[in-house]
C-alpha cells in the first residue's frame, strides 16, 4: 500500500448532501483517523 | 480496520424513549457527518439525520424534528441517536452510517444496526 | 407521488445483464441529482454501490465489482443499475436514494431474484 499523501488526496462527505457538500472535496483526513488509505492509484494525486 | 459498533437491541414502552450509541471502533471520529438511518420491518430505509462529529451540528429530517436528539461523545468516538415519545410503528432497526468520496471512490461505513422494538 | 418509484421485484437467470430503475417524480429532473445505489441483503445493513449523475460525475463503492454501473435514462426520468454477468449472491434488495430538499429519500427498493 502506499503511503497517504494527506497534502495531495482530497475528500468530500458522503452523507453531507450536495448543497451542502457543495461538491467539494476538502483536503482533510479520512472519517476515521487510524482508518487505512484509499490504495487506488486514480484516487492519489502526486503534489508535483 | 474501522467498524461503527452499536449498542444492543431495546424493547421499550410506547411514550418512552431510547438512546442508541455507535462507537468508532479502531478508529476516531473526524469531521464527516454521521447519519442514523432506520428500517422497519419489510421497509426500505429512511433516513432520520445527521450529525457531524467534529462540531456537534445538526441536520433532522422534517418526520423527526422535535423528537430526535443526536449528540457525540469524540472523548470515547461515540455517537449517540435518542428517539422520545416513541410509538409502535417506531418499531425498526436503526442504524448508524458514515463515510467519504475521493474523486473515483466511496467508502461507507455502517453499523451492525440496532432492533428497537415498542410494545405495550 | 412518491419521490423515488422502483419496481418491487425482478428476476432474471445467472450470467444476464439486468437493469434497476429509480424513476424520479415529475417535476424532479434526473440530471440534477446524482442516484445513490444500495444493496441489501437479510439481516446486513445496506451497502452502497454506487452513485451516478453523469459519465463525468460518478464513484463507485470501495470493493464493488465494475459490473456493477450506473446511467440514467433522461426520456424516463430514471436512475439505473445494470448488473452484468449476474450471480446467485447478486439476489438482494437494491435501493436508489438522492439528496432532495435537504433530505435523503429513499426508493421503496427491488428484490432481484436470480432464478436456477
Known amino acids: 500500500m502506499e503511503d497517504f499523501n494527506m497534502e495531495s488526496d482530497s475528500f468530500e462527505d458522503f452523507w453531507k448532501g450536495e448543497d451542502l457538500s457543495n461538491y467539494s472535496y476538502s483536503s482533510t483526513l479520512p472519517p476515521f483517523l487510524l482508518d487505512a488509505a484509499p490504495c487506488e492509484p486514480e484516487s492519489l494525486e502526486i503534489n508535483k | 480496520q474501522v467498524q461503527l459498533v452499536q449498542s444492543g437491541a431495546e424493547v421499550k414502552k410506547p411514550g418512552s424513549s431510547v438512546k442508541v450509541s455507535c462507537k468508532a471502533s479502531g478508529g476516531t471520529l473526524s469531521s464527516y457527518a454521521i447519519s442514523w438511518v432506520r428500517q422497519a420491518p419489510g421497509q426500505g430505509p429512511e433516513w432520520m439525520g445527521w450529525?457531524?462529529?467534529?462540531?456537534?451540528?445538526?441536520n433532522y429530517a422534517q418526520k423527526f424534528q422535535g423528537r430526535v436528539t443526536m449528540t457525540r461523545d469524540t472523548s470515547i468516538s461515540t455517537a449517540y441517536m435518542e428517539l422520545s415519545r416513541l410509538r409502535p410503528d417506531d418499531t425498526a432497526v436503526y442504524y448508524c452510517?458514515?463515510?467519504?468520496?475521493?474523486?473515483?471512490?466511496?467508502?461507507?461505513?455502517w453499523g451492525q444496526g440496532t432492533l428497537v422494538t415498542v410494545s405495550s | 407521488q412518491a419521490v423515488l418509484t422502483q419496481p418491487s421485484s425482478l428476476s432474471a437467470s445467472p450470467g444476464a445483464s439486468v437493469s434497476l430503475t429509480c424513476t424520479l417524480r415529475s417535476g424532479i429532473n434526473v440530471g440534477a441529482y446524482r442516484i445513490y445505489w444500495y444493496q441489501q441483503k437479510p439481516g446486513s445493513p445496506p451497502q452502497f454501490l454506487l452513485r451516478?449523475?453523469?459519465?463525468?460525475?460518478?464513484?463507485?463503492g470501495s470493493g464493488v465489482p465494475s459490473r456493477f454501473s450506473g446511467s440514467r435514462d433522461a426520456s424516463a426520468n430514471a436512475g439505473i443499475l445494470l448488473i452484468s454477468g449476474l450471480r446467485s449472491e447478486d439476489e438482494a434488495d437494491y435501493y436508489c436514494a438522492i439528496w432532495h430538499s435537504s433530505a435523503w429519500v429513499f426508493g421503496g427498493g427491488t428484490q432481484l431474484t436470480v432464478l436456477g
Open positions: 451516478y449523475k453523469s459519465d463525468s460525475d460518478k464513484q463507485q
Open positions: 450529525i457531524n462529529p467534529n462540531s456537534g451540528g445538526t
Open positions: 452510517a458514515s463515510g467519504y468520496c475521493s474523486r473515483s471512490r466511496c467508502y461507507d461505513y
